[in-house]
């Protein structure tokens, strides 16, 4: 994570800052939401455990044409050590439930804020 740069500030970014920036972006999405986020698109629910960042990206990357989450997708790619492309589900171990993108973002935000408060930045 110390090499995360490019989505907010130049050069290396401390892990705590990278996580903060992702949280801020998700907060902005939830607070600025007027119409249904991404036209109510559905994505696979994920287990918020190890490999969560890659799983989140694999789920969200299948939503196309939604500018509101493009920055989130870019940020998540900085947290995921491997390249993720649409239709790839290597980190999504369980694919049994689909939820709206708005709910996905809320769930992810709550979990990331808990990790931040606990000091778990990696």
């Amino acid at each position: 994570l110390t090499c995360l740069g490019g989505f907010a500030s130049p050069g290396p970014v401390p892990p705590s800052t990278a996580l903060r920036e992702l949280i801020e972006e998700l907060v902005n999405i939830t607070q600025n939401q007027k119409a249904p986020l991404c036209n109510g698109s559905m994505v696979w629910s994920i287990n918020l455990t190890a490999g969560m960042y890659c799983a989140a990206l694999e789920s969200l990357i299948n939503v196309s044409g939604c500018s509101a989450i493009e920055k989130t997708q870019r940020m998540l790619s900085g947290f995921c050590p491997h390249k993720v492309s649409a239709g790839q589900f290597s980190s999504l171990h369980v694919r049994d439930t689909k939820i709206e993108v708005a709910q996905f973002v809320k769930d992810l935000l709550l979990h990331l804020k808990k990790l931040f408060r606990e000091g778990q930045f990696n």
Partner: antibody, heavy 123, light 107 residues
Framework: EVTLKESGPVLVKPTETLTLTCTFS??????????VDWIRQPPGKALEWLAH???????RYNPALKSRLTISKDTSKSQVVLTMTNMDPVDTATYYC???????????????WGQGTTVTVSS | DIQMTQSPSSLSASVGDRVTITCRAS??????LNWYQRKPGKVVKLLIY???KLHSGVPSRFSGSGSGTDFTLTISSLQPEDVATYYC?????????FGGGTKVEIK
């Protein structure tokens, strides 16, 4: 109206354990995003953050004092308790509790404070 | 730990004056800077959070600015009730740290 009040001994002896209680009203520590912090200010010195506890029992401590501090909450009594072991004269200070809220961004801003309680460490 | 340096440590100004207090962080804290006011014999009050957001009930003569490492608290027109000590605090990284305070008096 949000209020917080600190209570505890005025005088403690060196090596003893200090127990401070923060009793609050106007909010609940069972409500999402709520937290309570402890801060102190020795005479003539800067404010120093000690610890905080969140509604979901996540606890964080100042690393410089972590081995001596324990923070806990009793939601039903609307109280947060801080214990500090092995007290020393340099721990003489006014101790404050304050509320913090993490809705939206996590600002770590303390929006309501107690009046403070002065603790003197002396034999 | 992030060191917070406030200046001046004290100042004296006339009613109606524009007063500026600065706070410098030893490293980048982005916009996570909060300002507090402690009046003699009163509880500490949050004035401004996240650099420039006014806490509820705070008069509009108070404002904050800055980013990164350098921040400013401004009182646009000093009032007698503004006599107090003002503290900055960084909320970016634990442990949370405070500036040494600025005591504001009326000439």
């Amino acid at each position: 109206e949000v209020t917080l009040k600190e209570s505890g001994p005025v005088l403690v002896k060196p090596t003893e354990t200090l127990t401070l209680t923060c009793t609050f009203s106007g909010f609940s520590l069972s409500t999402s995003d709520m937290g309570v912090d402890w801060i102190r200010q020795p005479p003539g010195k800067a404010l120093e953050w000690l610890a905080h506890i969140w509604w979901d029992d996540v606890k964080r401590y100042n690393p410089a004092l972590k081995s001596r501090l324990t923070i806990s909450k009793d939601t039903s009594k609307s109280q947060v308790v801080l214990t500090m072991t092995n007290m020393d004269p340099v721990d003489t200070a006014t101790y404050y509790c304050a509320r913090t809220v993490s809705s939206g961004y996590i600002y770590y801003a303390m929006d309501y404070w107690g009046q403070g309680t002065t603790v003197t460490v002396s034999s | 730990d992030i060191q917070m340096t406030q200046s001046p440590s004290s100042l004296s100004a006339s009613v109606g004056d524009r007063v500026t207090i600065t706070c410098r962080a030893s490293q980048d804290i982005r916009n996570y800077l909060n300002w507090y006011q402690r009046k003699p014999g009163k509880v500490v009050k949050l004035l401004i959070y996240y650099t420039s957001k006014l806490h509820s009930g705070v008069p509009s003569r108070f404002s904050g600015s800055g980013s990164g490492t350098d921040f400013t608290l401004t009182i646009s027109s000093l009032q007698p009730e503004d006599v107090a000590t003002y503290y900055c605090q960084q909320g970016n990284t634990l442990p949370l740290t405070f500036g040494g305070g600025t005591k504001v008096e009326i000439k």
